[in-house]
């Protein structure tokens, strides 16, 4: 760092709001796509290069001039597993968080020409190559089609698709957002023989309706209608099918074989929550009751003599929770051994920490292969000898992430592959393995600048640095950058972690205004070792504001005692803990306790509003962006996971006493900025509209901003710049900054 300890003597520029909004300082990524066990693709100057992992040499896989005459702007590409074809995506139109429609063309890499016959239709909703070869499955108008060869006609698999009613092979709104985190509801078998798919029926699901104002010339706004089950409302139903793609013919309809949910699920509302192929002819399905504390895994085998799928009751595995819900957000996926007779899965152990358990398909009980007062984040690869996983074990820091390998023949032999590679710079890793896990890319995202490296699994040797962000490092040497502190406080004999983005030349003898940046939803984590350039960087660097985040009760990756503390009680402990954190920060000596603010988005907007409405006297002001205001307004899958049903027999009382509106009177004591996008399909504008009405009804003066036609992300270029500029002004005014 070129600067001195004295802020006045440091002539370097600060990180400004414009720097954030214009992305002046860009973090360089190294996004690779593995195409085999030793080769990956990487896009450089719009050429697609193929790299040899072992030696690092590359050749041009596809020149950037190949599609000069294409006539469309290519949004994305996908190469068939056999390397013979490339799928080009264009005319991208966003729908919800993951979903979109697009047009597609297929380029034959051998013939070096576009395939012009039997093209995939425009407005296709999802396309995917088979795992081997070059079959294609796609969804168009809510129906599934399969192409055996890119130039052959499509075989229609389903005929029942209907907009907003029946979804074949794609998710409806709530399954996309809350269950699969994807638009796709198609699963190819490993060799591409079978195609499994879900069918969702939203016939009885109520519609959310909101206006979309569009261009100024539109005289009457459009009404957007989306089947969206709110808490306690009628849910979508689901069916599951498998079709054999070898048996498809255009002169007869495809036969899809249904696999029904277990009897223990059919007794009431339920969800399909995971689909994993174990072998070519074995599939595992996980089902979850609407009351999400009970799930069942079915393991189903193909019976060649009947063409049907059999799921033996003896192979069912039940996962339940007595203290909360199953999984972090849903039951974790199984990782099957090659023979499909056993699998590894992250589940909660007796102490309530999430660890890896080894299951044999015919046995009920499993053997934990990891243990401790830390959690396994994810299983990343499984070979015949090792299982690779990411955990936050190292140095007892829940906000860290490292890659480990465990020997399957001796579970005591565990090696951390990343811990000591660059311990000052790198404490938060993710990983990308080659097809058979012979090589892996480590992606370090903090606390230092991101670092991308390539490694061999044979000896866990580092092969080369792929990207070290040295150019950015050089640029940032000339900027007064904030520092990041990650630490914990102890409340009721429990460690709770927080992070602080501290202004340059931070002096603990001085008093700084503090902004609490909150999310605080179940299984959230805001205190971590990740390096970020964001709004907080500006606030700390230019405005000398401390930006803090705190992981209280309900937060994740520290065991179920903390996470399940808010079960059936959203809006209680997680809200109280943010207030307590601010009190604790006040006592640290460097916080101006007359200038403490809070802000959050989505769940964070809810917590911000609940905090400001608590009458604690701790906060001067706050900003809530796209907040939840009453849990009956939010979707069923998310809400009921934590709150149960809004019925008198279940948890209606707490639904009713956890609203922002009921705290309206207390907003007279604070300055409040309420912001929402009018086209928010997720947290509906309704939620802020009701806060606004309640505040007006009790005579509270507050500030508000809506963003016309913006969704939950408020992410269009102009809106993004506007909201952060507007919030900056509000915070500066609140803190009496020039």
């Amino acid at each position: 760092n070129k600067g001195t300890d004295d802020a006045t003597a440091d002539s370097r520029k600060t990180y400004t709001l414009t720097d954030y909004l214009k992305n002046t300082y860009r973090l360089k990524l190294y996004s690779l796509r593995w195409i085999s066990d030793h080769e990956y693709l990487y896009k450089q100057e719009n050429n697609i290069l193929v790299f040899n992992a072992e030696y690092g040499n590359s050749s041009v896989f596809l020149e950037n001039s190949t599609f000069d005459e294409f006539g469309h702007s290519i949004n994305d590409y996908s190469i068939s597993p056999d390397g013979q074809f490339i799928l080009l995506e264009y005319n991208y139109v966003k729908q919800w968080r993951h979903s979109y429609t697009a047009s597609y063309d297929i380029y034959d890499l051998n013939k070096r020409q576009l395939i012009t016959e039997e093209r995939i239709p425009n407005n296709t909703q999802w396309v995917t190559w088979s795992p081997v070869g070059h079959k294609l499955a796609y969804v168009w108008n809510n129906d599934i089609y399969v192409k055996i060869e890119p130039n052959l006609p499509s075989y229609r698999i389903t005929w029942t698709g209907k907009e907003d009613i029946i979804y074949n092979g794609i998710t409806d709104w709530v399954y996309e957002e809350e269950v699969f985190s994807a638009y796709s509801a198609l699963w190819w078998s490993p060799n591409g023989t079978f195609l499994a798919y879900a069918q969702f029926n939203d016939t009885e699901v109520p519609l959310i309706e909101y206006s979309f104002y569009s261009d100024e010339s539109l005289q009457y706004p459009k009404t957007v209608r989306v089947p969206y089950p709110k808490a306690g409302a009628v849910n979508p139903t689901v069916k599951f099918f498998v079709v054999n793609t070898d048996s498809l013919s255009s002169v007869t309809n495809a036969t899809s074989i249904q696999i029904t949910a277990p009897a223990s699920m059919l007794i009431g509302d339920h969800y399909l929550c995971d689909v994993t192929w174990a072998t070519q002819e074995r599939i595992s399905l996980q089902w979850l009751r609407r009351i999400q504390n009970y799930s069942v895994m079915d393991i189903c085998d193909y019976d060649e003599s009947s063409g049907r799928w059999n799921c033996l009751v003896a192979r069912q595995h039940i996962e339940m929770s007595t203290t909360g819900w199953v999984g972090r957000f849903r039951p974790s996926e199984p990782h099957f051994t090659l023979d499909g007779n056993s699998f590894y899965k992250i589940i909660s152990n007796e102490e309530g920490y999430r660890h890896i358990c080894y299951f044999q398909i015919d046995k009920k009980d499993c053997t934990f292969i990891t243990k401790g007062t830390w959690e396994v984040i994810g299983i990343e690869a499984l070979t015949s000898d090792y299982l690779y996983y990411i955990s936050n074990e190292y140095k007892g820091m829940p906000g860290g992430r490292n890659l480990y390998k465990i020997q399957l023949s001796d579970y005591t032999k565990v090696t951390c592959l990343s811990c000591e590679l660059n311990p000052e710079r790198c404490q938060y890793y993710s990983v990308s393995f080659s097809k058979e896990a012979k090589y892996y890319q480590l992606r370090c995202s903090g606390p230092g600048l991101p670092l991308y490296t390539l490694h061999s699994s044979v000896n866990d040797k580092g092969l080369r640095v792929l990207e070290d962000n040295s150019a950015l490092d050089k640029m940032l040497q000339n900027v007064q950058m904030p520092s990041k502190k990650l630490d914990f406080i102890i409340l009721n004999e429990t460690k709770f972690w927080y992070q602080m983005i501290l202004p340059p030349h931070f002096d603990k003898s001085k008093k700084y205004p503090l902004l609490l940046d909150v999310y605080a939803g179940p299984c959230s984590q805001k205190a971590d070792t990740v390096f970020r350039l964001n709004w907080a960087t500006y606030l700390a660097s230019t405005e000398n504001i401390i930006v803090a985040s705190f992981d209280g009760r309900g937060s994740g990756y520290q065991g179920d005692k903390i996470m399940h503390a808010i079960n059936r009680r959203l809006g209680t402990f997680e809200v109280e803990d943010q207030i307590e954190a601010a009190r604790q920060f006040s006592k640290m000596g460097f916080v101006d306790n007359k200038r403490i603010a809070i802000w959050g988005w989505s769940y964070g907007g809810y917590v911000t509003s609940m905090v400001l409405g608590s009458g604690s006297g701790v906060f001067k002001c706050g900003i809530a962006v796209a907040p939840v205001s009453r849990w009956e307004y939010y979707d069923s899958v998310y809400t009921e996971r934590y709150m149960g049903l809004p019925t008198p027999e279940d948890n209606l009382d707490h639904y009713r006493n956890s609203t922002v509106m009921s705290r309206a009177e207390n907003f007279k004591q604070v300055e409040y900025l309420l912001i929402h996008g009018t086209a928010d399909d997720n947290v509906h504008f309704q939620q802020s509209a009701q806060i606004s009405k309640a505040l007006v009804d009790v005579g509270v003066d507050f500030q508000a901003m809506w963003y016309t036609d913006e969704d939950h992300g408020i992410a269009s270029s102009t809106a993004h710049q506007h909201i952060y500029t507007h919030m900056s002004h509000f915070i500066k005014q609140c803190f009496s900054l020039p």
């Epitope: 006609p153 075989y155 070898d246 013919s249 255009s250 002169v251 007869t252 036969t255 003599s305």
Partner: antibody
Amino acid sequence: EVQLVQSGGGVKQPGETLRLTCTASGFSLTTYGVHWVRQAPGKGLEWVGVIWGDGRTDYDAAFMSRVTISKDTSKSTAYLQMNSLRAEDTAVYYCMRNRHDWFDYWGQGTTVTVSS
Amino acid sequence: EIEMTQSPSSLSVSAGERATISCSASQDIRNSLNWYQQKPGQAPRLLIYYSSNLHTGVPARFSGSGSGTDFTLTISRLEPEDVAIYYCQQSNKLPLTFGSGTKVEIK
């Protein structure tokens, strides 16, 4: 290796019933359809019908009333039964595996002669 | 039903020369056309599927083209082992129908 082995041909009397057998190996009859065609001496190929992987059947209208195609998946065998045989049913009968919209494997053929 | 008409009914071409067989459908069958080769005393075998796609193991001298109602099978350089009867077959609609065949001989 995919194979279709046919049996059951021979000389038949008019009015009799014919039952031909097509035994499959190297693939499953629950996955692939089996078609039957015939070829009269010195003539072209004539489609008779099909039994699909799921057991559904389709026939040419000319044979609908007197042909039944069936299968026993446990024996990996498909059958063609033709009633009320007449002289013009004299032909070589072939079974074939349906691969999407074409026939990629054929049986060796079995000769049926209808004569009094 | 869809009628398939093949022409010529027989064709005599010198070895090494090009042989062209036509097949026309009585209605639009898009590209749903297959070609089979039958040698004396043998079962037919698949040459080309879906108008222009060469089946595995078929020599590259065979090619197919066409769509809609008119299709062509071409043998670029006739070899002695190509002597056979060639049939087209539509797979667009049931009932499936075949052309009457074209006998190819060496001149």
